[in-house]
């Protein structure tokens, strides 16, 4: 051990007054004193790997990760971050220690992760691992639970790194499909972190605290079920744990299960098997495939094979960053007044989204349902036939998505009228947007059939009330028209509505309200 170099890992926090991007070197900035990161040899690792205590910084913070090496002779080095190599310029301090730095300016989510520093000296080669994470500035967090195998036991531990400490529960169901809804009698809940009964059909773990509830389902391939028409797909982010369960039932114990990734058997230690007899004396076997922290090369087709069942596969896709895939083009709908209708958004997302539907500045709860093809759908039916603009908004920590909908309700116009000293105005909200006519009522035309050809000014859709278009028409009155009754009529394909106004009155005068359909 005394042959190994003496390594010191430090973090230097900078007072931000810069907007440059990160660089692997030293960089002049106002700095606080270096903070030791307790670099230690990583136990049981292949080669000499040192690890630094996890760095936790605020968004937009600027930091330097620095390594000081007491080793004779020259050193060469290379930084690697998310599979990209970054150049490295070591220098020597007054104590003749090798100094290697990585400056991260204006910390963002994309700059969080593992920074690997490879150092080569005349005596030895070694790696230093820095993990940089963004501190959650909000005091409370609720993180999606994940699974881990319990040491030396065939059991799963459910973990949610949340503040305040969450209540963790397993949600188990032995039925199929709809009967596994949360409040169904088929659902059993166990408020504990460790689960030993791993043979159930549907296994979920949920964590809840003041911020709400987050759940993770144990991804399962059931060889006794007819495969889905589309290949099941599982998304994970780099560094997350992968768990896939393969389940099969057979009349006796004479069958085995195996996992393959891209036609290659999984390595020892990446899977474990359990078996039990069911009540009707058939044998149930389950085989777990797991990776404690996935990398890009864990992407691929995971196939579960059995000597007595047709094999089935799932596509595991490892992404650097979460996503929400959906078409964001706005959609317009027109429906009848009593027609049943729901807005619908079809999307593919990872991690799972949180969403809201908004209408008239009011937010409505948003439900999402997983489809068989790997997509999810969120529907909103509670519009109560109110025309206007509806907004669907989704986010998952890594991505945001907004989609606009316009709902038009087909109905005949309804006219509102008002008059001032110089003009008369009528407005209507019917759909399709109405056209206008103005008629004069006189001795010659007691039924108000005499057209008023001049002084009319129509404004189609002149104001938008929460997306609801309103059409209006204004009559500028001449001296000759004062004291007369006029009639404004709005008409569309569904009917006509009129309002009569006395022109010398200062307010509305609904003398007669006609409806000619």
């Amino acid at each position: 051990n005394q042959d190994l170099p003496v390594i010191k890992c430090v973090l230097i926090n900078h007072k931000n007054n810069d907007s440059s991007v990160g660089k692997s070197s030293s960089y002049p900035m106002v700095s606080e004193s270096p903070e030791d990161l307790g670099c230690a040899l990583r136990p049981q690792s292949a080669g000499t790997v040192y690890e630094a205590a996890t760095v936790e910084v605020d968004v937009s913070a600027s930091i330097t990760l620095q390594v000081l090496v007491d080793t004779p002779g020259n050193i060469s080095c290379l930084w690697v971050f998310k599979h990209s190599s970054l150049n490295c310029q070591p220098h020597f301090d007054v104590q003749n220690r090798g100094v290697v730095s990585m400056v991260i300016l204006k910390m963002t989510e994309t700059q969080a992760g593992e920074y690997l520093l490879f150092i080569q000296s005349e005596a030895t080669n070694y790696t230093i691992v820095f993990t940089v994470s963004i501190r959650n500035t909000l005091l409370f967090t609720l993180r999606r639970p994940y699974f881990r195998k319990m040491e030396n036991q065939d059991a799963l531990v459910c973990i949610s790194e949340s503040v305040p400490e969450p209540i963790v529960e397993w949600v188990l169901c032995d039925s199929q499909g709809e009967s596994c809804k949360e409040e169904s009698p088929a659902v059993v809940k166990k408020e504990e972190k460790v689960l030993h009964e791993l043979f159930g059909t549907d296994i979920r773990c949920c964590a809840r605290n003041e911020l709400g509830r987050e759940c993770t389902r144990l991804f399962t391939i059931d060889l006794n079920q007819t495969p889905q028409t589309t290949l099941p797909q599982l998304f994970l982010k780099v560094g997350e744990p992968l768990w896939i369960r393969c389940k099969a039932v057979h009349v006796n114990h004479g069958f085995g299960l195996t996992w393959e990734l891209e036609n290659k058997a999984l390595e020892e230690g990446s899977y474990f098997e359990m078996s039990t007899y069911s009540t009707n004396r058939t044998m149930i076997r389950i085989l777990f495939a797991f990776v404690s922290s996935v990398a890009r090369n864990d992407t691929g087709y995971y196939t579960c094979s059995s000597s007595k069942h047709p094999s089935q596969s799932a596509l595991v896709t490892i992404v650097e960053k979460g996503f929400i895939n959906a078409t964001n083009s706005s959609e317009d709908y027109e429906i009848d007044q009593y027609e049943e209708f729901c807005f619908s958004v079809r999307f593919k997302a990872y991690p799972q989204i949180r969403c809201t539907w908004t209408f008239s500045r009011k937010a409505f709860p948003c439900e999402q349902k997983a489809l068989d093809d790997g997509y999810s759908v969120s529907k909103f039916c509670n519009h109560k036939h109110q025309p206007g603009e509806y907004i669907f908004h989704a986010e998952n920590g890594d991505a945001q998505f907004t989609k606009m909908f316009t709902l038009n309700i087909r109905r005949k116009p309804q006219v509102l009228a008002e008059a001032s000293a110089s003009q008369a105005s009528c407005s209507s909200d019917g759909y399709p947007l109405p056209s206008w006519t103005w008629k004069k009522c006189s001795d010659k035309s007691p039924n108000c059939t005499e057209d008023i050809p001049e002084g009319v000014w129509n404004r189609k859709a002149n104001r938008k009330v929460f997306g609801q278009w309103v059409s209006s028409s204004t009559l500028n009155m001449s001296e000759a028209m004062k004291g007369f009754l006029v009639k404004c009529c709005a008409y569309n394909s569904l009917g006509t509505s009129c309002e009569t106004i006395l022109l010398n009155s200062p307010g509305p005068f609904p003398f007669i309200q006609d409806s000619i359909s």
């Epitope: 973090l11 307790g38 760095v55 993990t131």
Partner: antibody, heavy 127, light 107 residues
């Protein structure tokens, strides 16, 4: 250079509350996953783990002393404070604070125990 | 709570001797165990972490082994400065617990 220094009263009367302060330097209780732990050692006896606190405010306490202990931190002063209520002569001991770095592996945190210790402060409980 | 039983509680040895100290956990603790050396009037000092990884700057005559419930600290050739009390610590589950200590004395 990483240092931890314990401070507090040398003498405490039975039933009183003991307040100990650990002032740290050379590392941060804000910018890295670091913990500070308290351990005590009665004269001629073994070490006993009391409590710890991490940069994310995660806390743990000794089962037998949980009802009497409170641990907190003041990051602006780089201090961790331990209070122990209802002191008794059997609580006479040297009280140490020590550092626990936290390391990441995927989604997990790993702790390898205490890597740097303070020199300790002797507390006597007597009327 | 996990109990850590250290044996022997004390031993006498000469400079150059090979010394072995054992620590037994009341339940499996993987390799979440450290060994600490304490000299009279001084704070403990970490020798080994993760059951077998040598702390930087600690002489290579110290070594650790074991996993699960049985752990061993070995000093391959005892030196004058090694006469001290040695403690094991489990940090697998809360509360963390120390062994009762092994005092290594000069024969």
């Amino acid at each position: 250079q990483v240092t931890l220094k314990e401070s507090g009263p040398v003498l405490v009367k039975p039933t009183e509350t003991l307040t100990l302060t650990c002032t740290v330097s050379g590392f941060s209780l804000i910018n890295a996953r670091m913990g500070v732990t308290w351990i005590r050692q009665p004269p001629g006896k073994a070490l006993e783990w009391l409590a710890h606190i991490f940069s994310n405010d995660e806390k743990s306490y000794s089962t037998s002393l949980k009802s009497r202990l409170t641990i907190s931190k003041d990051t602006s002063k780089s201090q961790v404070v331990l209070t122990m209520t209802n002191m008794d002569p059997v609580d006479t001991a040297t009280y140490y604070c020590a550092r626990i770095p936290g390391y990441s592996r995927g989604w997990d945190y790993y702790y390898y125990g205490m890597d740097v210790w303070g020199q300790g402060t002797m507390v006597t409980v007597s009327s | 709570d996990i109990q850590m039983t250290q044996s022997p509680s004390s031993l006498s040895a000469s400079v150059g001797d090979r010394v072995t100290i054992t620590c037994r956990a009341s339940q499996g603790i993987r390799n979440d165990l450290g060994w600490y050396q304490q000299k009279p009037g001084k704070a403990p000092k970490r020798l080994i972490y993760a059951a077998s990884t040598l702390q930087s700057g600690v002489p290579s005559r110290f070594s650790g082994s074991g996993s699960g419930t049985e752990f061993t600290l070995t000093i391959s050739s005892l030196q004058p400065e090694d006469f001290a009390t040695y403690y094991c610590l489990q940090h697998n589950s809360y509360p963390w617990t120390f062994g009762q200590g092994t005092k290594v004395e000069i024969k």
